[in-house]
């Protein structure tokens, strides 16, 4: 502060700055006029003994003689462009003359007016039946503000010992209502912004699965309380889980875009169809009203049951050597809509019964031809078979003469009926 | 004599530049604060801006925010208006105006007491 | 931004008629509006500053009024050459804003 400026006589101040009083925004001028012979100096702005560095001020010199050496008018004039609470103070004028420090006399800047909001209730959409919060908070000059809450334009009984509530505590409302807070002082009343509290309905709870089918769920759900609005349709999303899924679980948004059925409710329950066999989904669940929808449920986890596969074992070969009959084959290539649990075997021949063996899950088997009686078109079919059950079944396939050097057969050839020169096999 | 001469208006594409000069005489232009102030045809006034060429300091209003600039050389007692991405809803007669400052120490507000003749601006294909 | 409504927008009036403009704010201003005077093709020209002082060279047949949100400008005899749009302005707060504008016509 500048402790050594003079404002006894001598002083070449000859107007100093009046005084401002005024609400939040307003735009003043301070004016300040002095008279000096010579050169005129510059006119710097002080709030409360400080410099103002950036002063929005202008400056005139007006000469009142015909030479620079004459008198001079200096007129300074300092804009508050939009009073704000840092602005309010001790304004003064100073120009340093001949090595002196001149100041002028104060003027000064207040700043009183209506209640100024530092925080306005805001819009929110909220579950029915649930306790929300909406803040309000509001300023002087002049001191002090009271505050009046507002529900659909009636005013609230200000909560015992809390005349001036910044936090409005609700327990709940049934209906979209509409809040807005009023702040009082000595100048009058302002009215805050009206904020709109939508009710939404409360988040689904007990999300569940009815029944599993390969291809089918069946889930059923209870929903949450919807205030006056009855819920028109809840929407389900189904996801297909992946070794991912831990990471977006948390967050709101699965990483790609997930199956969304709508349904209308009552009865809450849905049938989800054309799913594939012993998979891993997430399901959530959210019921809308006219307000809008309520929350998501959190990621449900649920899988579907197992399928038969859906194709015979492919490649299917009978080769006799001797007295044994090698049979081969290969995995289905169609999906096997669960745990491949293993191969069935059967074969006949023309006039006896058919003969039925579990496998494993190895791909070929050595049967043993045994007897004397001879067996006509003797044939092998064979099916896979999960925890659902088999497959189909290949189709029949006749027994082929060993050829020498054949190798692995990797499908079988169409040939000649077999001799009938074998009996019953035996293993 | 106090005056403002206006000049630099015309015709100008969308999306264009126009520079427009405001001449003052008969008073220092670093003692006052300078307004353009523009009326589109047939409407009423509007307010585009104002500058203190005595510290440079410029203010605008939000419909030219970042598009017009508002600068002043008080050597040549002139201030400017640089205006930048031209619309068609810029067409308007823009007019400089001096600010009264002939209270005593203190104001609330203020007034336009000395005004050019006004140049026409027109932005059209 | 403040608003300031001006009425009537257009009036007709003789010579030697009082005519009085209102202008309303649409928050309060204090004394902080000025009134103009506009021709056509010409600029305006200040009448009233601070609500209600005289600008100076201005017929004393003008004069301001109000506070607050309410003014007034009145013409206590109307004269040929005051036939021209009048606005008000207010400069409590940036931005500064105009009325539309009140055009007085000969009747």
């Known amino acids: 502060a500048h402790k050594d400026t003079q404002t006894e006589a001598g002083s070449p101040f000859v107007g100093n700055p009046g005084n401002i009083t005024g609400a939040r925004g307003l735009t003043g001028t301070l004016r300040c006029e002095l008279q000096v012979q010579g050169e005129p100096p510059e006119v710097v702005w002080l709030r409360d003994g400080q410099i103002l560095e950036l002063a929005d001020n202008t400056q005139t010199q007006v000469p009142l003689g015909e030479d620079w050496q004459d008198e001079w008018k200096v007129v300074s004039q300092l804009r508050i462009s939009a009073l704000q609470l840092s602005d309010a103070g001790e304004y003064q004028c100073m120009v340093h003359l001949e090595g002196r420090t001149f100041v002028s006399q104060p003027g000064f800047v207040g700043l009183e007016g209506l209640p100024y909001f530092l925080e306005e209730p805001e819009d929110k959409a909220v579950p029915a039946n649930t306790p929300f919060n909406l803040s309000c908070q509001a300023q002087g000059p002049p001191e002090p503000v009271t505050l009046l809450w507002l529900q659909d334009a009636v005013p609230l009984a200000p909560v015992t010992g809390h005349s001036s509530q910044h936090s409005l505590q609700t327990p709940g409302l049934n209906k979209t209502s509409s809040f807005s807070c009023e702040a009082h002082n000595a100048k009058g009343v302002t009215t805050s912004r009206t904020a709109t509290i939508t009710v939404l309905p409360q988040r689904p709870h007990h999300l569940h699965v009815v029944s599993r089918q390969p291809t089918e769920l069946e889930v059923a759900w209870t929903p949450g309380l919807s205030g006056i609005y009855p819920l028109t349709h809840c929407n389900l999303q189904a996801v297909l889980s992946d070794d991912g899924v831990g990471i977006w679980l948390g967050k709101s948004d699965p990483p790609e875009d997930p199956l969304t059925l709508q349904v209308s409710v009552p009865p809450h329950q849905l049938r989800l169809e054309k799913l594939l066999p012993h998979t891993p989904y997430h399901i959530r669940i959210s019921c809308s009203s006219s307000q809008g929808p309520s929350p998501w449920t959190h990621w449900l986890p649920v899988e579907t049951t197992e399928g038969v596969p859906l194709g015979p074992p492919e490649n299917v070969s009978a080769m006799r050597n001797g007295s044994q009959v090698l049979v081969r084959w290969q995995e289905p290539r169609v999906p096997l809509q669960g745990t491949l649990l293993g191969y069935r075997l059967a074969y006949r021949g023309q006039d006896t019964p058919e003969v039925l063996m579990d496998i494993g899950l190895t791909r070929e088997v050595t049967l043993e031809l045994r007897g004397d009686r001879p067996v006509a078109n003797l044939t092998v079919s064979v099916t896979a078979y999960t925890s659902a059950g088999d497959g189909p079944w290949s189709l029949p396939v006749p027994l082929e003469p060993w050829r020498p050097g054949q190798g692995q057969p990797l499908h079988h050839l169409v040939s000649e009926p077999p001799p009938r020169a074998f009996s019953w096999p035996w293993w | 004599e106090v005056q403002l001469v206006e000049s630099g208006g015309g015709l100008v594409q969308p999306g264009g530049s126009l520079r427009l000069s405001c001449a003052a005489s008969g008073f220092s232009l670093s003692g006052s604060w300078i307004h353009w102030v523009r009326q589109a045809p047939g409407k009423g006034l509007e307010w585009v801006g104002w500058?203190?060429?005595?510290?440079?300091?410029?203010y605008y209003a939000d419909s030219v925010k970042g598009r017009f600039t508002i600068s002043a050389d008080t050597s040549k007692n002139t201030a400017y208006l640089q205006m930048n991405s031209l619309r068609a809803e810029d067409t308007a007669v823009y007019y400089c105006a001096r600010e009264y400052s002939g209270w005593g120490g203190s104001s609330v507000g203020y007034a336009m007491d000395y005004w050019g003749q006004g140049t026409l601006v027109t932005v059209s294909s | 931004d403040i608003q300031m409504t001006q009425s009537p927008s257009s009036l007709s009036a003789s010579v030697g008629d009082r005519v009085t403009i209102t202008c309303r704010a649409s928050q309060d201003v204090s004394t902080a509006v000025a009134w103009y005077q506009q021709k056509p093709g010409k600029a305006p020209k200040l009448l009233i500053y601070?609500?209600?002082f005289l600008y100076s060279g201005v017929p004393s047949r003008f004069s301001g009024s109000g506070s607050g949100t309410d003014f007034t400008l009145t013409i206590s005899s109307l004269q040929p050459e005051d036939f021209a749009t009048y606005y008000c302005q207010q400069s409590y707060t940036t931005p500064p804003t105009f009325g539309q504008g009140t055009k007085v016509e000969i009747k």
């Open positions: 500058i203190n060429p005595y510290r440079g300091y410029a």
């Open positions: 601070s609500a209600s």
